[in-house]
């Protein structure tokens, strides 16, 4: 038996940040589970992971490049990101494992949240602008 | 909830080497990282050595790159930590730490659980 995941297609982060929600038909409700999320096509690359105890608060973990806070729903976790760079433009997925209580559950895989990172374009106001028109 | 049970360590001359082992049991996810931090009397604990899951990734303290290779055995859920050319600076309490993080992290606050820690000294 496997847990289905639910993410959004798409997000575009135009300030840096985005928020990935990632929902679960599993109610994580006073379970111990751990939530993660990584980038890239085959998932190579784990960059943030939310630890859920039914004892102690969300342990929420990020790695280094990455600014990663998570919120935690009955069935869903939100990845919230910051300070995106450009490059890290690619396409994320949710994965969940629920360890307890038993039996041992994880996800089927989901189909990925493309990340969208803009950057930020800033116009330069011109110092001396001409004179204004009457 | 996770325990970890170390053994190795003792007393060794300047260059000599030893091999410490961490043997974790409990209930374990499918991704975790495992590493080696130290403390000297008076110093706060300080990261040595970290391994991920998959042992495609590893990372070290400056102070021991070359000398102390850390590995790790998944079918016995077990780090170690070979360490030689030891030099007196290295003498300190050795404490094994588990992450649920995936990756070789070497912040001491990603760590959840700690070994009982193993004395090493080293004799000038």
């Known amino acids: 038996n496997k847990i289905l995941v639910k993410q959004s297609p798409m997000l575009v982060a135009y300030d840096n940040a985005v928020n990935l929600s990632c929902k679960y038909s599993y109610n994580l409700f006073s379970r111990e589970f751990r939530a993660s999320l990584h980038k890239g096509l085959d998932s190579a690359v784990e960059v943030c992971v939310v630890y859920g105890n039914y004892s102690q608060q969300l342990q929420v973990y990020s790695k280094t490049g990455f600014n990663c806070d998570g919120k935690l729903g009955n069935e869903s976790v939100t990845f919230y990101l910051q300070n995106l760079y450009v490059n890290q433009t690619d396409i994320y997925f949710c994965k969940i494992e629920v360890m307890y209580p038993p039996p041992y559950l994880d996800n089927e895989k989901s189909n990925g949240t493309i990340i969208h990172v803009k950057g930020k374009h800033l116009c330069p106001s011109p110092l001396f602008p001409g004179p204004s028109k009457p | 909830e996770v325990q970890l049970v170390q053994s190795g360590g003792g007393l060794v001359q300047t260059g000599g080497s030893l091999r410490l082992s961490c043997a974790a049991s409990?209930?374990?996810?499918?991704?975790?990282?495992m590493g080696w931090f130290r403390q000297a009397p008076g110093k706060e604990r300080e990261f040595v050595a970290a391994?991920?899951?998959?042992?495609?990734?590893?990372d070290y303290a400056d102070s021991v790159k070359g000398r102390f290779t850390i590995s790790r055995d998944n079918a016995k859920n077990t780090v170690y930590l070979e360490m030689n050319s030891l030099k007196p600076e290295d003498t300190a309490i050795y404490y094994c730490?588990?992450?649920?993080?995936?990756?070789?992290?070497?912040?001491?606050?990603?760590?959840?659980?700690w070994g009982q820690g193993t004395q090493v000294t080293v004799k000038p």
């Open positions: 409990g209930r374990m996810f499918s991704n975790y990282a």
């Open positions: 391994i991920n899951y998959r042992r495609d990734s590893a």
């Open positions: 730490g588990f992450t649920y993080a995936g990756w070789a992290s070497s912040r001491r606050d990603d760590y959840n659980y």
